[in-house]
């Protein structure tokens, strides 16, 4: 070996200076008598080496690197050898920081593994090999006096946690625990924890299960769930409090928390939930009232709440067939009585014959909002219910009675906008209990089965806005029937449009007679069309060759018109505009030429 490097310290604080010397022995005879020693840090040549010849003939170069800013680098001592650099010796330099104080030390007692697991945050990177050791001792008091030391716990490389096994633990007694961090630049220690391992016990959650239905037990109420849990075996005798959380599986609802529940409740009825809804449930527990840590949430249990019987009011209306008055068409509408009124699976219309106690005869069972059935001759009333798997709504009686009540008067209708009609009336005396308003297409498209209807519960109402199934340019028949205690009044009807259409085209103009200064025109009026409002007037327009325009307004019954004051031998463009309240339409243009002064009149 020709050269040897020695350094002031191979490991320094990052950014600190470092001094190195390189000595070349004299007996390296193949070298120049006065060789020039060069320094290289990594791949870069470093200036500043001070070289001298020592008394024993060896050459020495000393260099000071003012700041070592590499966390790891090789420092080489070299000579120029021909055209290349010859490395005589090199050393590895390292730079970094002493370990920061480990922080956030915390421990959990795991009863499954019977060990105390402690974890910490090591702090910023030191750039140097740093070892962590979990140190602990047993203590009788509050860790002021140190008892027996416990074997150091050394984590696996790169881990910031360590397990103290059961054989080194003393439960129900305090232990002093801290973390020591050490590297070449120093040692640091975390603040000491003083704890009884049982006070940091982290339990496992119970296992949630659905309760097996027992024949004698009542089924859960609507919006309720019956569940039970199996305690975690190692925590059987530990006092705990638990909490449940639940949320509907569908939608974005957040978890709702229920608790505290004693662990030993073991079974629980959870109510106040939405009926007929799938829920996700979880449970967790904590040692209580003694200290401890919350368990993780248990695996989810998914359960569905039972549904509730429909809570609806059924508004009803009926019609008899004209040809067969015993055939009744019954209509109904469910009106929710609560925000969650229960799912409706279907409807049943039934009749209870008098004298047959308990006998109920179903007349129809349907999922529709109407049904047609034959009314037994002695039947004056039927009952209608909505049902689902949980039961039925309160029965709605439907009484079939003659129209004996007074009629309403002055029934009228007017358009509000293209999709709504206002129907108004004068209430009869006495006030009815309410009204049924029916509407549907008028002739020629009229159909009893396609009518829409609404119940107006306010007997003092003097009108109703029809917003359902109203389209512009259609004629509607609106029928209003007053309802009384045990009867109804006669139905009244009125026809109306929500929006009428402008005439689709104006009549074609025809020239009947022409002269030098006049022209007689005629036209055949368009036949009236349903959905189109009647004509209010015509306007006739004529324009001469000089682009001067003239017009005249004619009433809707006009069939012709004579233009006077025309210029002889002149060209005119004429068109007719047919107008109604809904708009106007122009005819095609008729072009004509008046006769020359010497010409004879044409008739």
């Amino acid at each position: 070996e020709c050269g040897h490097i020695s350094v002031s310290a191979p490991i320094v604080h990052l950014g600190d200076p470092i001094t190195a010397s390189c000595i070349i022995k004299q007996n390296c005879s193949h070298l120049d008598p006065e060789p020039q020693i060069l320094w290289r840090l990594g791949a870069e040549l470093q200036p500043g080496g001070r070289q001298q010849r020592l008394s024993d003939g060896t050459q020495e170069s000393i260099i000071t690197l003012p700041h070592l800013n590499h966390t790891q680098a090789f420092l080489s001592c070299c000579l120029n050898w021909g055209n290349s650099l010859q490395i005589l010796d090199q050393v590895e330099l390292r730079a970094g920081y002493p370990p920061a104080i480990p922080h956030n030390l915390s421990c959990l007692m795991n009863l499954t593994t019977s060990s105390l697991i402690c974890q910490w945050e090591p702090g910023p990177e030191t750039h140097l090999p740093t070892s962590f050791t979990l140190k602990s001792f047993k203590s009788r008091g509050n860790c002021q006096t140190q008892g027996d030391s416990i074997l150091d716990c050394v984590p696996k490389d790169g881990q910031s946690h360590c397990c103290i096994p059961r054989k080194h633990l003393l439960l129900y007694q305090n232990m002093g625990i801290w973390v020591q961090a050490e590297n070449a630049l120093g040692t640091s220690m975390s603040p000491q924890l003083c704890l009884d391992p049982m006070d940091v016990v982290k339990l496992e959650p119970p296992m949630l299960r659905t309760m097996d239905p027992s024949p004698e037990a009542a089924p859960p109420q609507a919006g309720c769930l019956q569940l039970c849990w199996e305690p975690w075996q190692p925590g059987l005798h530990i006092n705990q409090k638990c909490e449940l959380r639940h949320k509907p599986q569908r939608g974005e609802a957040s978890w709702a928390l229920v608790g505290p529940l004693p662990l030993e409740a073991l079974q629980y009825e959870l109510c106040g939930l939405l009926p007929a809804t799938a829920y996700t449930l979880q449970i967790r527990c904590i040692r209580w009232p003694l200290p401890g840590h919350w368990s993780d949430w248990s695996p989810s249990l998914e359960l569905r709440t039972t549904e509730r019987a429909p809570t609806v009011r059924l508004d009803t209306w009926w019609r008899q067939r004209q040809l067969d008055p015993r055939t009744v068409q019954l209509f109904w509408k469910p009106v929710p009585l609560e925000e969650d009124s229960g799912r409706i699976q279907g409807y049943v219309v039934s009749w209870r014959p008098s004298g047959q106690a308990g006998a109920i005869l179903p007349l129809c069972n349907t999922t529709e909002l109407s049904c047609t059935f034959h009314l037994p001759s002695e039947a004056q009333e039927v009952a209608l219910v909505a049902y689902n798997s949980a039961g039925t709504s309160r029965p709605t009686p439907v009484v079939f009675s003659e129209s004996r009540g007074p009629a309403l008067t002055r029934l009228h209708a007017m358009a509000r906008d293209p999709h709504s009609l206002w129907v108004g009336w004068e209430p009869p005396n006495p006030w009815p209990q309410g009204y049924v308003i029916e509407w549907g297409l008028g002739p020629p498209s009229a159909s009893n089965s396609n009518k829409t209807w609404r119940m107006e519960q306010n007997g003092r109402a003097t009108g109703f806005l029809l917003k359902e199934n109203i389209r512009p340019f259609q004629l509607y028949e609106i029928i209003v029937t007053p309802l009384y205690q045990d009867t109804m009044g006669p139905s009244q009807h009125v026809y109306a449009y929500s929006q009428e259409m402008a005439p689709s085209h104006a009549p074609e103009l025809h020239l009947k007679h022409i002269g030098k200064t006049w022209a007689q025109l005629e036209w055949v009026p368009e036949p009236p069309e349903l959905g189109k409002s009647p004509l209010t007037h015509y306007t006739i327009f004529w324009t001469n060759a000089q682009n001067q325009s003239f017009s005249a307004i004619l009433n809707a019954s006009s069939r012709g018109f004579v233009l006077h004051g025309l210029e002889p031998a002149s060209l005119y463009h004429i068109h007719l505009m047919a107008a109604s309240q809904a708009g106007a339409t122009n005819s095609t243009v008729l072009t004509l030429m008046t006769l020359t002064p010497e010409g004879s009149e044409l008739h």
Partner: antibody, heavy 118, light 107 residues
Framework: EVQLLESGGGLVQPGGSLRLSCAAS????????MGWVRQAPGKGLEWVSS????????PYADSVKGRFTISRDNSKNTLYLQMNSLRAEDTAVYYC???????????WGQGTLVTVSS | DIQMTQSPSSLSASVGDRVTITCRAS??????LNWYQQKPGKAPKLLIY???NLQNGVPSRFSGSGSGTDFTLTISSLQPEDFATYYC?????????FGGGTKVEIK
């Protein structure tokens, strides 16, 4: 002083009933499971029953199930064992004991002798 | 139900001897094993809980080990006051159960 004192033992005929009591003092009774352990003359220890801190969970040994009932009154710091349909084989010293969180009996009463004989 | 089997049922030993008693569970019970000492006419006394934890006031010559199904109570140097019957007990299940006992007598 932390202690448990049993009472209520004595001589009873087969088929008869007896109620044992155990008065606790010196610790927070309502926080702990409690239990009864018995020892027949010259025999080993036999677990009879336990009761959770609020009384909601009450496991029993098969040999006494349906005949014995364990209960507690946390307001009186007292544990009970109601013994019905007693048999000769129920003759034993009955110990009341406090259960620690890990299921160990860390405090015992002095025991009360129950003799079932005609 | 969990059965506990203790062995030997009795043993003779001299003061200063090292004594080992074993207890086997019919199924795994983790570390939920406790040891008791009972002297004639007295209530049992807790020695070791959770397999290896020494109860307060119990001399350090008593130690426990094991987990799962096999457990051991060791008295490192038998003292005159240690002649008694020793019981193991599992606390893994609601149904607690004891071993049959080991009587330690003077040789």
């Amino acid at each position: 002083e932390v202690q448990l004192l049993e009472s209520g033992g004595g001589l009873v005929q087969p088929g008869g009933s007896l109620r044992l009591s155990c008065a606790a003092s010196g610790f927070t009774f309502s926080l702990y499971w409690m239990g009864w352990v018995r020892q027949a003359p010259g025999k080993g220890l036999e677990w009879v029953s336990s009761i959770s801190s609020s009384g909601g969970v009450t496991p029993y040994a098969d040999s006494v199930k349906g005949r014995f009932t364990i209960s507690r009154d946390n307001s009186k710091n007292t544990l009970y064992l109601q013994m019905n349909s007693l048999r000769a084989e129920d003759t034993a010293v009955y110990y009341c004991a406090k259960l620690g969180e890990l299921g160990m009996y860390d405090l015992w009463g002095q025991g009360t002798l129950v003799t079932v004989s005609s | 139900d969990i059965q506990m089997t203790q062995s030997p049922s009795s043993l003779s030993a001299s003061v200063g001897d090292r004594v080992t008693i074993t207890c086997r569970a019919s199924q795994g019970i983790s570390s939920y094993l406790n040891w008791y000492q009972q002297k004639p006419g007295k209530a049992p006394k807790l020695l070791i809980y959770y397999a290896s934890n020494l109860q307060n006031g119990v001399p350090s010559r008593f130690s426990g080990s094991g987990s799962g199904t096999d457990f051991t109570l060791t008295i490192s140097s038998l003292q005159p006051e240690d002649f008694a019957t020793y019981y193991c007990q599992q606390s893994w299940a609601y149904g607690l159960s004891f071993g049959g006992g080991t009587k330690v007598e003077i040789k």
